[in-house]
Interface confidence: low
């Protein structure tokens, strides 16, 4: 019998795009692709394994912003950006099973407007196949 | 006989914590995990397995200090950042087998307190599964 | 029969090292290592697989120049500096089968030597092993 | 407090060498790039010299290249400059500087001056 | 090889604005930095990368480039401003070169 080597089972990632921030609210994001191995359920992107991740965060705004991207209700931001028109961040977290991944957005303009987004990106990438999973 | 996929051998990887560093010499290092794939002695973070690594480097200190991240006697740092009271920076570097991930830390100051650190925090993430690993 | 646990596939990733750049053209890459699992062709890496990549670029040049990398003609680049005179960044990029990563490079000085470059090293990781890949 | 304290300026006869050092202090001195500097007695300032923050890069002035050396002494946290073959044109005031970033000049020493005279 | 162009003196007057230009060819495309010299001491840096204060210089200390030239603003001069100042930038073969300088009179 022919040994075939093993192939990686798919790792979990995602890109999502946003084009579009609401003030006191978040970003509305979409997937572009049907392929990814996670999932955005409510505006927010779904972890179901455990361990660290890769993300990268990108975006040109209309307006200037304060941003910050949570996991889980009580915990301090995965990112924190304050008073910017503009986001390139790269970092590393370790998330779990149940986390959920989403923005929250401040603006200090008077105007109740939607924030335009240009080039808005959110990726993440697990770090850790082979540790604890929950689909 | 049902084949069942192949999951994936665990990843090594650490994430190590750090509340207090010491002039001239470097930072006191704790796992706060046990089920961590790498492990910590003697104040370093040992390499097993040869190849790249995801670095990322977090902290708030006390004082204003110039901070180093070594990995091999004679080579030039991992990091290296001079005058500084935070570090959130994030790199790659090749790592081998024998290496040891260490910290060395100088402060200016005339006291020889020593520094504290608030959300001190060092994550390497092998990026090469498959390479050559020595346990 | 014993089970052994099965091994990683290599994942497909490179080190580039450059110590050149010619005006309003690249930078002269060599991989130092014959075990890298990705090739340099025509002064471009060749990208096999498709998915995410962490890309890390560092170098310090010997003028102020303006520098881009590329990976489809068409497309914006994966990173773009303007008059710098060193370069330490990471990204993370979505690459696929048939892309070539290269340098474009403009100095903006009245002599038309290369530029020389110290420290000149670009690292391609490949983040989604057990997507598609074509050899 | 950053420091920069050059030694080993003083009177030569042309044709002759001198060595001068500047003992840094008050940084990290592998991570900052070095660069040597002169002014002439009632010139302006004129680059000589550089080197790397790891040291396998350097660059000097045309008039001085093959006749100066710049290294420096990690262990000694000493940037050197080796002059040979002096002129009576090299007669200055040398300045060591370091930068975080290799085009700056971020921090000066006081000088130490080399005067060429038969 | 590049040449870096400044007036040998500049005058102004107490608290008004003083400009002092350094000419280079296309100098808008280098970053330009210059430097305070007093006299018997060692060379400051006051602006980087066109136009960046370095911690502790005053915020009347302004820098600007585009073109062939570029300009150090000193908006209401001071009598310790009085000093020699020198723009720089790294040329096209890995040296750093210096203007001239220009000595401001502050009146």
């Known amino acids: 019998l022919q040994q075939v080597p093993p192939q990686y089972p798919p790792i979990q990632s995602i890109r999502v795009q946003f084009t579009r921030c609401e003030n006191e609210k978040g970003c509305i994001i979409t997937s572009p692709s049907k392929d990814e191995t996670m999932k955005v359920q409510d505006n927010s992107i779904i972890i179901n394994c455990d361990g660290f991740y890769l993300i990268s965060l990108k975006g040109y705004f209309s307006e200037e912003l304060s941003l910050s991207l949570y996991y889980r209700k009580g915990r301090g931001p995965l990112f924190s950006l304050s008073k910017v028109t503009s986001v390139d961040s790269i970092g590393v977290a370790y998330l779990a099973f149940k986390d959920k991944v989403y923005f929250n957005v401040t603006t200090h303009s008077t105007s109740y407007k939607d924030i335009q987004v240009n080039g808005g990106e959110l990726i993440l990438i697990h770090q850790n196949p082979g540790g604890f999973c929950a689909y | 006989l049902q084949q069942v996929p192949p999951q994936y051998p665990p990843i090594q990887s650490i994430r190590v914590q750090f509340t207090r560093c010491e002039n001239e010499k470097g930072c006191i290092i704790t796992s706060p995990s046990k089920d961590e794939t790498m492990k910590v002695q003697d104040n370093s973070i040992i390499i097993n397995c040869d190849g790249f690594y995801l670095i990322s480097l977090k902290g708030y200190f006390s004082e204003e200090l110039s901070l180093s991240l070594y990995y091999r006697k004679g080579r030039g740092p991992l990091f290296s950042l001079s005058k500084v009271t935070s570090v959130d920076s994030i790199g790659v570097a090749y790592l081998a087998f024998k290496d040891k991930v260490y910290f060395n830390v100088t402060t200016h100051s005339t006291s020889y307190k020593d520094i504290q650190v608030n959300g001190g925090e060092l994550i390497l993430i092998h990026q090469n599964p498959g390479g050559f690993c020595a346990y | 029969l014993q089970q052994v646990p099965p091994q990683y596939p290599p994942i497909q990733s490179i080190r580039v090292q450059f110590t050149r750049c010619e005006n309003e053209k690249g930078c002269i890459i060599t991989s130092p290592s014959k075990d890298e699992t990705m090739k340099v062709q025509d002064n471009s890496i060749i990208i096999n697989c498709d998915g995410f990549y962490l890309i890390s670029l560092k170098g310090y040049f010997s003028e102020e120049l303006s520098l881009s990398l590329y990976y489809r003609k068409g497309r914006g680049p994966l990173f773009s500096l303007s008059k710098v005179t060193s370069v330490d960044s990471i990204g993370v990029a979505y690459l696929a089968f048939k892309d070539k990563v290269y340098f474009n490079v403009t100095t903006h000085s009245t002599s038309y030597k290369d530029i020389q470059v110290n420290g000149g090293e670009l690292i391609l990781i490949h983040q989604n092993p057990g997507g598609f890949c074509a050899y | 407090e950053v420091q920069l304290v050059e030694s080993g300026g003083d009177l030569v006869k042309p044709g002759g060498s001198l060595r001068l050092s500047c003992v840094a202090s008050?940084?990290?001195?592998?991570?900052?790039?070095m660069n040597w500097v002169r002014q002439a007695p009632g010139k302006g300032l004129h680059w000589v010299a550089f080197?790397?923050?790891?040291?396998?890069?350097?660059s000097y002035e045309d008039t001085v290249q093959g006749r100066f050396t710049i290294s420096r002494d990690y262990a000694k946290n000493t940037l050197y400059l080796q002059m040979n073959s002096l002129r009576a044109e090299d007669t200055a005031v040398y300045y060591c500087?370091?930068?975080?970033?290799?085009?700056?000049?971020?921090?000066w020493g006081q000088g130490t001056l080399v005067t060429v005279s038969s | 090889s590049y040449v870096l162009t400044q007036l040998p003196s500049v005058s102004v007057t107490l608290r008004q604005t003083a400009h002092i230009t350094c000419g280079g060819d296309?100098?808008?495309?280098?970053?330009v930095y210059w430097y305070q010299q007093k006299l018997g001491q060692a060379p400051v840096m006051i602006i980087y990368?066109?136009?960046n204060r370095p911690t502790g210089i005053p915020e009347r200390f302004s820098g600007a480039s585009s073109g062939n030239t570029a300009t150090l603003t000193i908006s209401g001069s001071l009598a310790e401003d009085e000093a020699d100042y020198y723009c720089?930038?790294?040329?096209?073969?890995?040296?750093?070169?210096f203007g001239g300088g220009t000595h401001l009179t502050v009146l």
């Open positions: 500087a370091c930068g975080s970033i290799w085009t700056h000049f971020d921090y």
């Open positions: 008050g940084f990290t001195f592998n991570t900052y790039h």
């Open positions: 080197i790397n923050s790891g040291g396998s890069g350097t």
């Open positions: 296309i100098i808008g495309s280098k970053s």
């Open positions: 990368r066109d136009n």
């Open positions: 720089q930038v790294w040329d096209s073969r890995t040296q750093a070169l």
